[in-house]
């Protein structure tokens, strides 16, 4: 008796975070024996879509011409071979940006900060939101969530960083979101360049979360410290 069919691989091109109106292609790769591919979307009737395999039959394409709110969500795919259906793929989370107006990102007291000092990145939205995300460009673990407790709506979130080291320097953007769908994000804020001076011999910050020892400085997750004053927001790592 053969074991279960291996699970397919599911991915999105050009990526899984897509601006409203832009195209995205979801690919499901199985085996050469695949006869049919099926894509399921969480909380939607199954199957969400079916496609015949593209030659040489080991993958299928699911096309989304223009990203809208309807497409944001969690997907899994399967393939059917002569012996039956495969295991489900690992999930793919498709996130749409542009659902809400862009927040404003600023640095207090200044985006030019001396190593060893403190800086707070402030993400402010025009309308109350309950989730704020800070993203650092070219970081392997770029997302830091601040999510309000008990559904309280906030106009801003503070991301304190102390002590600042060279690792913190770089380009940041923030997004805001509502808790009812973390697959829908605002337009990105304008970029903020955080410049750390006097940091040639800075020690690495001690992480507050375990990180792979293979990670280099740019792979380090953001390490804000301290409380989040008066915000009612709770920190979540992604």
């Amino acid at each position: 008796q053969a074991g279960p069919l291996p699970k397919p691989t599911l991915w999105a091109e050009p990526g899984s975070v897509i601006s409203w109106g832009n195209s995205v292609t979801i690919w499901c790769q199985g085996t050469l024996e695949a006869r049919e591919y099926r894509l399921d979307k969480e909380e939607s009737p199954a199957p969400w879509d079916r496609q015949n395999p593209l030659e040489p039959k080991n993958k299928a394409r699911f096309s989304i011409p223009s990203m809208t709110e309807d497409y944001a969500g969690r997907y899994r795919c399967y393939y059917r071979s002569p012996v039956g259906w495969s295991q489900p793929s690992d999930p793919l989370e498709l996130v749409m940006t542009g659902a809400y107006s862009k927040p404003t990102l600023s640095a207090l007291p200044s985006p030019l900060v001396t190593s060893g000092k403190s800086v707070t990145l402030l993400c402010q939205s025009r309308s109350p939101m309950d989730t704020f995300l800070l993203i650092k460009e070219r970081a392997a673990h770029p997302l830091l969530h601040l999510r309000s407790e008990h559904g309280a709506q906030q106009h801003q979130a503070e991301f304190p960083m102390s002590p600042v080291t060279s690792v913190h320097g770089g380009t940041y953007r923030c997004f805001s979101s509502h808790g009812f769908s973390h697959y829908l994000l605002s337009h990105p804020s304008d970029p903020l360049e955080l410049i750390v001076s006097g940091s040639l011999e800075d020690p690495r910050p001690s992480p507050t979360r375990s990180v792979s020892t293979a990670a280099g400085p740019e792979d380090q997750p953001l390490m804000p410290t301290g409380s989040v004053p008066h915000s009612g927001l709770r920190r979540h790592w992604e």
Partner: antibody, heavy 123, light 107 residues
Framework: QVQLQESGPGLVNPSKTLSLTCTVS????????WSWIRQPPGKGLEWIGY???????NYNPSLKSRVTISVDTSKNHFSLKLSSVTAADTAVYYC?????????????????WGQGTTVTVSS | DIQMTQSPSSLSASVGDRVTITCRAS??????LAWYQQKPGKIPKLLIS???TLQSGVPSRFSGSGSGTDFTLTISSLQPEDVATYYC?????????FGQGTKVEIK
Amino acid sequence: QVQLQESGPGLVNPSKTLSLTCTVSGGSISRYFWSWIRQPPGKGLEWIGYIYDSGSTNYNPSLKSRVTISVDTSKNHFSLKLSSVTAADTAVYYCARRGGYYGSGSYGGMDVWGQGTTVTVSS
Amino acid sequence: DIQMTQSPSSLSASVGDRVTITCRASQGISNYLAWYQQKPGKIPKLLISAASTLQSGVPSRFSGSGSGTDFTLTISSLQPEDVATYYCQKYDSAPWTFGQGTKVEIK
């Protein structure tokens, strides 16, 4: 059977604003992209822009500074405004529908078109 | 912006001939391509979307192929009623640009 009908003045003075409306009958505006396309006499098709049911828009960069597309879901219609018109804006103007979500049939192309309305820019 | 280039701009063929129209995108557009037929004095009609998916009611002599940058519309056996101008159009990310059109006539 969904039908689209363009309406608006057939003659517009130069430098004025062209205003057209497309009325959607026999179906919903929801989950579709609604486009305006034009065709100058004897020439090809030119995409002007689209609006989604949420009100989000995208425009042809060559016309963006002069174009506004809006939607009124309660009246089941969407509209085009093109400002500062010249003789080069003389054309047949079409409204058209493109599916916005799986299951809406067209899978990407514009599957329903209005009959078109001729707009002449002249004094 | 991505440009769409059709060739030829016009062609003349006999009834029963196999006719091929090509459309080239200046950058890859996956399979986000539609083909339209516009008969003289009429409105455009969607023939094919997703590069190769035939719309319901379109005769099977029409077919589409291609992905990425190079696409083809084929009429396997040209009929008198196929006299029209054919347009390709990209519909991935805006702008949804049309090709300049290919006019098909009967010899």
